[in-house]
Every structure is written in structure tokens, then in C-alpha cells.
């Protein structure tokens, strides 16, 4: 009897371990999205970036959805969100319209239930990119910890999108779930 | 009989709890490495920084290895990687040859199995550090979420290494495991 | 007998799952604190920022305490700490005292047991904010992984606090626990 119970217990505990491990993984959605350089919009004002890779190079996604240029939360939780945005200009690209630039990123959250958009994080700098230098570069990094609900969407807006560095190591954003909501 | 089973179960569950707790800890490698100022290389182009502290001040490492200037992954997983790099110049530091500087960081991943190096993240800025000011400073921060395999190596490259701020709160990089690979 | 044991085991395992889930949540303190713009100090030198929101907008806190302008650790562990600090100036705000600015952030840890303060992370830039431009902006982001003990306090110091951007998406800091101390 006792031996049978022990064996049964071990079996149940084994499956419990699998279940715990599996549920732990499922409890941790993430995404790392890299810029799709073939589809960067023009303009100097605030523009939403809608083209990102989620399945090539460093791009990846799990238990989240990428749709219509937005990263969609599938699971309630507290997430660490981050973005790295690089801007560059070389004199061979032609003259800049202005030497005084506002290079900015805005990480926004949109709720479909209550159609509204809120900026979670912003960063950037005003820059003077003078003609005395043949090359200019600038990067912004932002990150923060936010409560996200299933269905909410994260998107990235930037100024001067035509100056974006199209490399996957330069312009990207992401999220990973850290913990459940109590 | 029933009492005996209860006692035995508590005992087994107790050890399961220990095991779960222990395995959770072991599943979370991390490192925070701070610059070793006594061994900063010279050069103006991209230079690999190989001297970091992992066991003094804020420097620490667990379930990862630091060897030959590289942070070695011992355990497959998804990791959050970050770097903070500070550059500075004071008029007493030396004869700065140019006002136009490219201050950059590159976080690279090297696979030994397939000898190749890839940049995961980059950041920085071109700067104009004029002689009209006696002190100049600039910091870069990058961070992102990456899949790393056991044996892969993370290293840091910078431009203008002689301008690095040698403080442990200024120039550092690190990683921590967030979750397993499915 | 065997059926009764199975039922009992399921019940015990169920509560174990609740306990595990609950203890996991309790093992993950976090905070995201946003600047309280009604109480920003003046000055151009290093100033401690003591007014932050922890319960409105993006501000939130759990299993940590905010008191006297400091974020207090209630639970030993390894934490990821971050800060995003934005500075801005518009010509309508009046003339700057100087065009040469040092815009800096320092994330400090204070131990009450051993009354001492140490800088964990710093970042920033010297800037030339010339009168040729009507608007200036600059953001700093820092982040890193640190061992924190219960009772230790995290605070934020900045230079030129009067130039801080008072938006909750602009100037904030935070922490979340990643793992226990072995």
C-alpha cells in the first residue's frame, strides 16, 4: 500500500513539475521587435512606426501578438518595456532641411476598450547637426515597468523617421513579463 | 495509515519546495561587470574592452563566467542585456586632438561553435566637444532582450576608449536571465 | 483508501499551487515612481529629488515603501533598477543663466545600518544650449542589476532640477526584483 502511494505520488509530482514549469514559461510573454527598414515613413513630425520584424534576426515574439504596427498584450501582467532608437545622417545622403533637429521617441499604450492613447515613456534630444561634420549619429534608450492588460497595444512614435538607422542592433523595442497582477 | 501518508507527503512536499526554490535560483544566472580602469586600451576606432571587475564593488556574477574579456553564457535562456558607458574629458586630461567625436558602444555576441560575431545592440552619439568648455561628459545606455545559448560570449566594444569614465557607477554592463527557452 | 488519498492529495496540491503562486508574487517587489512636478527644487548643482508619485498615473509600488523621498527596500534580493530623466528649456521660460550645462542623474543607495551613500549608476551629458534655438531637450536613461538588502534606500539626484520635464512619461525611476539572494 505504502509503496503504491509513494509511486503514485512521484508520478503526480512529476506531472506537477512539468505543469509548473510549463505554466511558468507561459506566464512569461516577451517580444523584441527590430525596425523594418524597407518601410520607414518620411516626415519630420511625430510619426508612428508600424513596420517591425518579429521573426528574423534578433526579432522574436512569444505569447504576445504583433499586428498593424502594434505589439498586442495577450496576458495581463507587469512588463518591462524598452526601446532603443538610433538616428544618423551622412553628408552623402544630401543636405538636411535644418541643422536644428528634435530627435524623439514616444512609447505609447492604446486601450481598445476605452479608445485612448497614452505615452508611457519618452526620450530624446534636440541636436545641432552642423555641416562642418560629415557624419552625425544619436541614440535614445528608454525603459520602464508597466501594468499591461490583455488587449492593450504598445506602439512607437518618433520624430524625423527618415533619419532612423535601419540596423536591427540600432532601432528596436521590446517587452517581457516580469510578474502577474495580484 | 492516513496520518502516516500526510506526514510523508509534507516531508516530500517540503523537499520539493526546497528543490523548486533552488532550481529557480539556479535558473537565473546574472552578471554586472564594472570597468577595470587600470587597463583601458588606447585607440580611436572600435576597440574591445577586455578588463572588467566581477567580484568587487558593484561587480558580481552568478552562473555565468567571465573569461578573456568576455561574459560567457553557461545556461540557455532569454536574457536581458544592458550596458552603460560614460565618456568624459577635462582640460587637464590631455591634449584632445579633435572636437568632433564619435562616442559609441557595441554589445556583441560571439558563438564559438560557428566562429562569428554579431552586434546585438549599439548606441552613442557624435559630439562636438569644444575647447570653450573645460569639462565634457556623455553617457550611453542600451538594453534589450535576447536568446542566448550556452557557450555564447558577450563582449563590449567602444570607440575612443581613452575617454571612458573609469568609475564603477559610470561604465558597466550586465545580463540577467528572465526565462528558459521553450 | 486509495481514492481518499488521491482526493486529499489533490486538495493539498491545490493549496500548494496557491501558496507557490502567492509566494512568487510576494517575492517580486516593484516600484515605478514618477516625478511630482509641484515640488521640484531649484539650483544647478547636485540636488536630491524627494517628491515622486507612487499611486497615480503610471506610478505604482508593491512590497517596497516610499518615504521621505526615498524608495525603501523591504525584501532582500537582486533588483533591476532604472531611471529616465528628461530636461528641457523653452525660450519662453526665460533666459538660461549659462549656455553650458551639465545635465546629470545619479542613482544612489543609502544604508541606514552603516550611514553611507553610494552611487550605483550615473549618466548624463554636458550640453551647449545656445540662444539660437527656441527649444532644447535632453533625456538620460540608466539601468543596472544590483543586490539590495531590506532597509536600504534608493534615491535620485540630478543637476539643474529646474530644467526637469515634469511629465510622468519623461522623468521617473523604478525597480523590480528579479531573484532572491542565494
Amino acid at each position: 500500500g505504502s509503496q503504491h502511494i509513494r509511486a503514485e505520488k512521484a508520478m503526480v509530482d512529476g506531472s506537477w513539475l512539468d505543469l509548473a514549469k510549463r505554466s511558468k514559461l507561459e506566464a512569461q510573454p516577451f517580444a523584441h521587435l527590430t525596425i523594418n527598414a524597407t518601410d520607414i515613413p518620411s516626415g519630420s513630425h511625430k510619426v508612428s512606426l508600424s513596420s517591425w520584424y518579429h521573426d528574423r534576426g534578433w526579432g522574436k515574439i512569444s505569447n504576445m501578438t504583433f499586428s498593424n504596427g502594434k505589439l498586442i498584450v495577450n496576458q495581463d501582467g507587469f512588463y518591462y518595456l524598452y526601446a532603443n532608437i538610433c538616428f544618423r545622417h551622412h553628408e552623402t545622403s544630401g543636405d538636411l532641411a535644418t541643422e536644428y533637429l528634435q530627435l524623439m521617441v514616444y512609447v505609447t499604450k492604446t486601450s481598445i476598450k476605452i479608445p485612448s492613447s497614452h505615452t508611457l515613456m519618452k526620450g530624446g534630444s534636440t541636436k545641432y547637426w552642423s555641416g562642418n561634420s560629415e557624419f552625425h549619429f544619436y541614440s535614445i534608450n528608454v525603459g520602464g515597468f508597466f501594468k499591461l492588460r490583455s488587449g492593450e497595444e504598445i506602439s512607437i512614435e518618433v520624430s524625423n523617421p527618415s533619419l532612423l538607422d535601419p540596423d536591427q542592433d540600432a532601432t528596436y523595442f521590446g517587452a517581457f513579463k516580469v510578474r502577474d497582477i495580484d | 495509515g492516513s496520518q502516516h501518508i500526510r506526514a510523508e507527503k509534507a516531508m516530500v512536499d517540503g523537499s520539493w519546495l526546497d528543490l523548486a526554490k533552488r532550481s529557480k535560483l539556479e535558473a537565473q544566472p546574472f552578471a554586472h561587470l564594472t570597468i577595470n580602469a587600470t587597463d583601458i586600451p588606447s585607440g580611436s576606432h572600435k576597440v574591445s574592452l577586455s578588463s572588467w571587475y566581477h567580484d568587487r564593488g558593484w561587480g558580481k556574477i552568478s552562473n555565468m563566467t567571465f573569461s578573456n574579456g568576455k561574459l560567457i553564457v553557461n545556461q540557455d535562456g532569454f536574457y536581458y542585456l544592458y550596458a552603460n558607458i560614460c565618456f568624459r574629458h577635462h582640460e587637464t586630461s590631455g591634449d584632445l586632438a579633435t572636437e568632433y567625436l564619435q562616442l559609441m558602444v557595441y554589445v556583441t555576441k560571439t558563438s564559438i561553435k560557428i566562429p562569428s560575431s554579431h552586434t546585438l545592440m549599439k548606441g552613442g552619439s557624435t559630439k562636438y566637444w569644444s575647447g570653450n568648455s573645460e569639462f565634457h561628459f556623455y553617457s550611453i545606455n542600451v538594453g534589450g532582450f535576447f536568446k542566448l545559448r550556452s557557450g555564447e560570449e558577450i563582449s563590449i566594444e567602444v570607440s575612443n576608449p581613452s575617454l571612458l569614465d573609469p568609475d564603477q557607477d559610470a561604465t558597466y554592463f550586465g545580463a540577467f536571465k528572465v526565462r528558459d527557452i521553450d | 483508501g486509495s481514492q481518499h488519498i488521491r482526493a486529499e492529495k489533490a486538495m493539498v496540491d491545490g493549496s500548494w499551487l496557491d501558496l507557490a503562486k502567492r509566494s512568487k508574487l510576494e517575492a517580486q517587489p516593484f516600484a515605478h515612481l514618477t516625478i511630482n512636478a509641484t515640488d521640484i527644487p531649484s539650483g544647478s548643482h547636485k540636488v536630491s529629488l524627494s517628491s515622486w508619485y507612487h499611486d497615480r498615473g503610471w506610478g505604482k509600488i508593491s512590497n517596497m515603501t516610499f518615504s521621505n523621498g526615498k524608495l525603501i527596500v523591504n525584501q532582500d534580493g537582486f533588483y533591476y533598477l532604472y531611471a529616465n530623466i528628461c530636461f528641457r528649456h523653452h525660450e519662453t521660460s526665460g533666459d538660461l543663466a549659462t549656455e553650458y550645462l551639465q545635465l546629470m542623474v545619479y542613482v544612489t543607495k543609502t544604508s541606514i545600518k552603516i550611514p553611507s551613500s553610494h552611487t550605483l549608476m550615473k549618466g548624463g551629458s554636458t550640453k551647449y544650449w545656445s540662444g539660437n534655438s527656441e527649444f532644447h531637450f535632453y533625456s538620460i536613461n540608466v539601468g543596472g542589476f544590483f543586490k539590495l538588502r531590506s532597509g536600504e534606500e534608493i534615491s535620485i539626484e540630478v543637476s539643474n532640477p529646474s530644467l526637469l520635464d515634469p511629465d510622468q512619461d519623461a522623468t521617473y525611476f523604478g525597480a523590480f526584483k528579479v531573484r532572491d539572494i542565494d
Epitope: - | S42, S44, N132, N160 | -
Partner: antibody, heavy 122, light 107 residues
Amino acid sequence: EVQLVESGGGLVKPGGSLRLSCAASGFTFRNYAMSWVRQAPGKGLEWVSGISSGGTYTYYPDTVKGRFTISRDNAKNSLYLQMNSLRAEDTAVYYCARRDYGDVYEWYFDVWGKGTTVTVSS
Amino acid sequence: DIQMTQSPSSLSASVGDRVTITCKASQDVRTSIAWYQQKPGKAPKLLIYSASYRYTGVPSRFSGSGSGTDFTFTISSLQPEDIATYYCQQHYSSPWTFGGGTKVEIK
């Protein structure tokens, strides 16, 4: 062809002044720090001044500090050395030299002019 | 200021000989040493920088080594066109200082 051509040398009395010029061609002058290096007759080389690529940093050894002033005009691809309160020991061939790219704090010289002779004598 | 002491001040060698010149710095300069060649009546030419890196177009018979305070410049096989005075320079800290020179002649 990368070239540096010095001019302005000559004979001057002690206490007098002289302005040397160096015309640069064949490279993007504004990208390089520049220096003046002199060589007294039958002696070795002595660095006498340096200027950053943008012209906002100037450097001198103690032997000439306060007497010599280095400057540049990037629009004209030109480097200058204004020498005041000249002494007999300033007699030398003065070379204009381009600092090679390298560590921002380290100066060595990859392109040199042919030199111009300065003689300080009463 | 960092003093650079070069030796010998002059030497005579045959074509094909291995020629070695040494330079000693008065303090540690890591590997921040350059070597120049100056022919009579001409401007100096950069041969080596950062102790051991040959400048573009410099023949492979010229090499440099050393770190800290002791440095060596070598011509592996002396050629007639190598007749010149050779100078070391520290590029570690300002003011930039040169050695006294080594005059190389053919026997």
C-alpha cells in the same frame, strides 16, 4: 597628393615677431589636428605647438607658452604660427606636421612639410 | 615632461646587416612610441607608431617593439637608402618629446 607647404620664415631680431603659414592640400584639412615642430641647426626635433581639428584647443610646451600662438582657418586650409618675443634659441627650421588619426589624446605625425627657416639674430 | 634617451647616437653598419636602435622613456609610456626617419635636408617620415605598427607604405624590414619604458627599433637588413637619422617620439602625454636621434651610416 597630400601636401603641406610652409612659408613666412626669415631673419628677425631678438624680441621681434614673425608669422608662419602652412598651406594644406590633398586631404580634408578640417578633420585633422595639426602641429608645428622645429629643428635647431644640427639638433634634434622639438614639438612647439598643436591645435585641434576644429581650432578650439591649442597646446604648447613651456618653452614657448605665452610667446607663440597657433591658429587655423579651415575654410582656407591653412595653419598659422604667430611668434612673438623671439629669442636666439628659437632659431630653427619650422615644420608644419599633420597629426595622424589615432587615440584622441596621442599625437604623432604622418605628414610633414619641407620646413621654413627662422633665424633670430641681432 | 617625459625625457626620451636614444642610443647609440650614431652607428655604422654594412648593407644587409641587422641594425637595432633603443629608446628609453623616463616614465611608463605603455606602447605610445613612434619612430621617424630623416634624411639630410629633408623632413622626417613616420615609420612606426604605437611601438610596433608600421605606417602605410613602410617596408617590412622596419619594425618596432617594446612597452613601458624600453623600446627597440630594428632594420632587419640594412639597405643603402636607409642612411638617415632615426628619431623616437613618445605620444603618451603632452608635451610630445623626441629622442636625440641616431645617425645610421654605411661602413
